[in-house]
């Protein structure tokens, strides 16, 4: 696994990366596991990076990724009772200039290098479906969320409301 | 809806304490962060600092040593607590807060009206 010391370097409390130019409102560093307790690590093959989904062993160090929080600049079309906050979107970056990116064409999720501002494809929906479990819904397909499929993270469709709450979808967030 | 409301600023000297409180009410299904920023006359708002929902935290390297964070999650609230504070310090400072509601699984920002710290001799 890589990452830890990379993601180190850059903790700054903010620093610039935008979807409309502007930066992000928060970050901070956290490890992402599954719902049923795997971890995402990251490593780097054959000069590319690769995302995995494993079991850690007892005494193993877990990947940090750096979590940059962005308001929507677009106000909600939601109703209800949370119209009066901004939506926010997430970008995730497990090592200094590398973010996790939606491809929608090969319903896969992958690790690119790229420059500022970042595209899209790189921002995701943030959802609570439990208490301490979040979801990553692509700002670029609504309804398709980051998912766990062969040991590998995946883009997998959501139908429905009801089927937010499928376990593959859920990920927790360790500051730990 | 959700509501932040803080407290606790006002005029101290440098080197004085102060600390700020804000408390979140209304329908919150979860909290992903809570935080603390500031807008000092005449220029941008930036953060101060950041609690998680698991305790995480992230500070402004300005503020570093000298400022705590900490939260308390049965009653929704985050508190600043300020030490060594030097006139760079005078801002209003804004409460913020990443939050879903129970009408939507989105979690959006919400953030307080602001309280004011004024750091004079």
């Known amino acids: 696994a890589f990452g830890i010391s990379g993601v180190q370097k850059y903790t700054r409390a903010l620093h610039d990366s935008s979807i409309t130019g502007i930066s992000p409102i928060t970050e901070y560093l956290a490890s992402l596991s599954t719902y049923n307790d795997q971890s995402i690590t990251f490593a780097l093959e054959d000069e590319s990076y690769e995302i995995y989904v494993e079991d850690l062993k007892k005494d193993e160090k877990k990947d940090k990724v750096l979590l940059s929080y962005y308001e929507s600049q677009h106000p909600s079309n939601e109703s209800g009772d949370g119209v009066d906050g901004k939506m926010l979107m997430v970008t995730l970056s497990p090592t200094k200039d590398f973010w996790l990116h939606a491809n929608n064409k090969e319903h896969s999720v992958e690790l690119h290098k790229c420059e500022k501002p970042l595209p899209d494809q790189a921002f995701f929906v943030l959802h609570n479906m439990h208490s301490n479990c979040v979801s990553f819904e692509c700002k670029t397909d609504p309804g398709v969320f980051i998912g766990v499929k062969d040991n590998h993270l995946a883009l997998i469709k959501v139908d429905s409301s009801e089927n937010l709450c499928t376990e593959n979808i859920l990920f927790k967030l360790s500051e730990t | 809806q959700v509501q932040l409301v803080e407290s606790g600023g006002g005029l101290v000297q440098p080197g004085g304490s102060l600390r700020l409180s804000c408390a979140a009410s209304?329908?919150?299904?979860?909290?992903?962060?809570m935080g603390w920023h500031r807008q000092a006359p005449g220029k941008g708002r930036e953060l101060v600092a950041v609690?998680?929902?698991?305790?995480?935290?992230n500070y402004a390297d300005s503020v570093k040593g000298r400022f705590t964070i900490s939260r308390d999650d049965t009653k929704n609230t985050v508190y600043l607590q300020m030490n060594s504070l030097r006139a760079e310090d005078t801002a209003v400072y804004y409460c913020?807060?990443?939050?879903?509601?129970?009408?939507?699984?989105?979690?959006?920002?919400?953030w307080g009206q602001g309280t004011l710290v004024t750091v004079s001799s």
């Open positions: 913020n807060a990443a939050a879903s509601t129970y009408s939507s699984t989105v979690v959006r920002s919400f």
């Open positions: 209304g329908s919150i299904r979860t909290v992903n962060y």
């Open positions: 609690v998680t929902s698991g305790g995480g935290t």
